[in-house]
Amino acid sequence: DVQYPPKKVTTVIQNPMPIREGDTVTLSCNYNSSNPSVTRYEWKPHGAWEEPSLGVLKIQNVGWDNTTIACAACNSWCSWASPVALNVQYAPRDVRVRKIKPLSEIHSGNSVSLQCDFSSSHPKEVQFFWEKNGRLLGKESQLNFDSISPEDAGSYSCWVNNSIGQTASKAWTLEVLYAPRRLRVSMSPGDQVMEGKSATLTCESDANPPVSHYTWFDWNNQSLPYHSQKLRLEPVKVQHSGAYWCQGTNSVGKGRSPLSTLTVYYSPETIGRR
């Protein structure tokens, strides 16, 4: 009675192909003949699953990275089968938005390029989708802005699709820095004020980051010794009549308002004295 190890051992995948991430995969360990009889089976990678009793291995919720598996049929000796590739298919992984240009801060007017990156996908054929606030923006791997504006700021996501599924990036916040714009001088209580009362001029603007420094100018383009957002004239004099404008500065640059005219008229008392 000649004893010999198990012959022609093969690992057979029982599932229909393709196998998808999350599937339950059943493999059997087959052999042609053995003397003495096969008493146990081994599987590689070792210890990844509970020791299967018969020559059948069930992998619950198969991972995307389960690549190859081999079995051995053992009597007094173990004979190993060639490894089989599970070839698990999975949706794109590790999707993220990456800013290609510029490297650091984004300024209004810049040409900006965002890249939708992913680490791997099986199958490799993918589609891209960009969205902002639920609105589809593009279907390329890159999202390009020729001249970005403050209105383009917001939360962006990209999606990568393959035949198995789709994966979204984390929301990516695009912040646009811009010099003060839309500056205007507002006047309170109005642009016509009686002498002796108070007039407040406010420099209103839109800026990111906010304006850090204001400069006020009169009709002669003479800078006034005031550097806050509000210019308070109290008591206001007839000589204060004229056009005023303001300049706002932030870390990006400067902006200036158009001229606004303040008219200060004489009080009845002054008129009566004349």
């Epitope: 510029p102 490297l103 801060e105 300024h107 810049n110 040409s111 001249s147 850090s212 870390s251």
Partner: antibody, heavy 115, light 107 residues
Framework: AVQLQQSGVELVRPGASVKLSCTGS????????IHWVKQRPEQGLEWIGW????????EYASKFQGKATITADTSSNTAYLQLSSLTSEDTAVYYC????????WGQGTTLTVSS | DIKMTQSPSSMYAFLGERVTITCKAS??????LTWFQQKPGKSPKTLIY???RLVDGVPSRFSGSGSGQDYSLTISSLEYEDVGIYYC?????????FGGGTKLEIK
């Protein structure tokens, strides 16, 4: 990729003026400010000033007021730095840079002021 | 003008060592601070902006922190290619101002 190409080495006499150039490729210089930075031999970096090529607005560090004049020609996508009344103190490498917080830099122009 | 005081002006460190460089502004700069690396004969290269945001492609061993007036650049484990001069730049106000630089060399 954004690139800034600067003019070559300059050797000039004291008291003279010089105009250095910085040409953008793969981007329009109107997209952001062009900054100029000075680096004297074995020394640190000094910000000279910037220009907004879109409208010609400029801003200078007080130290360089009267010494430096920054201009731009959008038709050739080029910014310039003119330095006047040169002395040995102006011997340095001059860089142009653009975008964000100075993301992209030219290779630098070496200016030597010597008689 | 905002003055940026950088320290140390030069330092030696062992490969694998943790290295920290600091920059102190003469007034608050709202985290508008960039760190550059410059190698001999080369232009500066941006590593970190807005005090703590790593530029894409810069190794993750570089990190930045700080707020208000005090900022720092840390290299978690020094590598040979990290030798060079490091500069901080404040871009909160005009004129832009640089720190004096820190020359980093291997022991």
């Amino acid at each position: 990729a954004v690139q800034l190409q600067q003019s070559g080495v300059e050797l000039v006499r004291p008291g003279a003026s010089v105009k250095l150039s910085c040409t953008g490729s793969d981007f329009n210089i109107k997209e952001d400010y062009i900054h100029w930075v000075k680096q004297r031999p074995e020394q640190g970096l000094e910000w000279i000033g910037w220009i907004d090529p879109e409208n010609g607005d400029t801003e200078y560090a007080s130290k360089f007021q009267g010494k430096a004049t920054i201009t731009a020609d959008t038709s050739s996508n080029t910014a310039y730095l003119q330095l006047s009344s040169l002395t040995s103190e102006d011997t340095a490498v001059y860089y142009c840079a653009t975008y964000g917080s100075l993301d992209y830099w030219g290779q630098g122009t070496t200016l030597t002021v010597s008689s | 003008d905002i003055k940026m005081t950088q320290s140390p002006s030069s330092m030696y460190a062992f490969l694998g060592e943790r290295v920290t460089i600091t920059c102190k502004a003469s007034q608050g700069i709202n985290s508008f601070l960039t760190w550059f690396q410059q190698k001999p004969g080369k232009s500066p290269k941006t590593l970190i902006y807005r005090a703590n945001r790593l530029v894409d492609g810069v190794p993750s061993r570089f990190s930045g922190s700080g707020s208000g007036q005090d900022y720092s650049l840390t290299i978690s484990s020094l590598e040979y290619e990290d030798v060079g001069i490091y500069y901080c730049l404040q871009y909160d106000e005009f004129p832009r101002t640089f720190g004096g630089g820190t020359k980093l060399e291997i022991k």
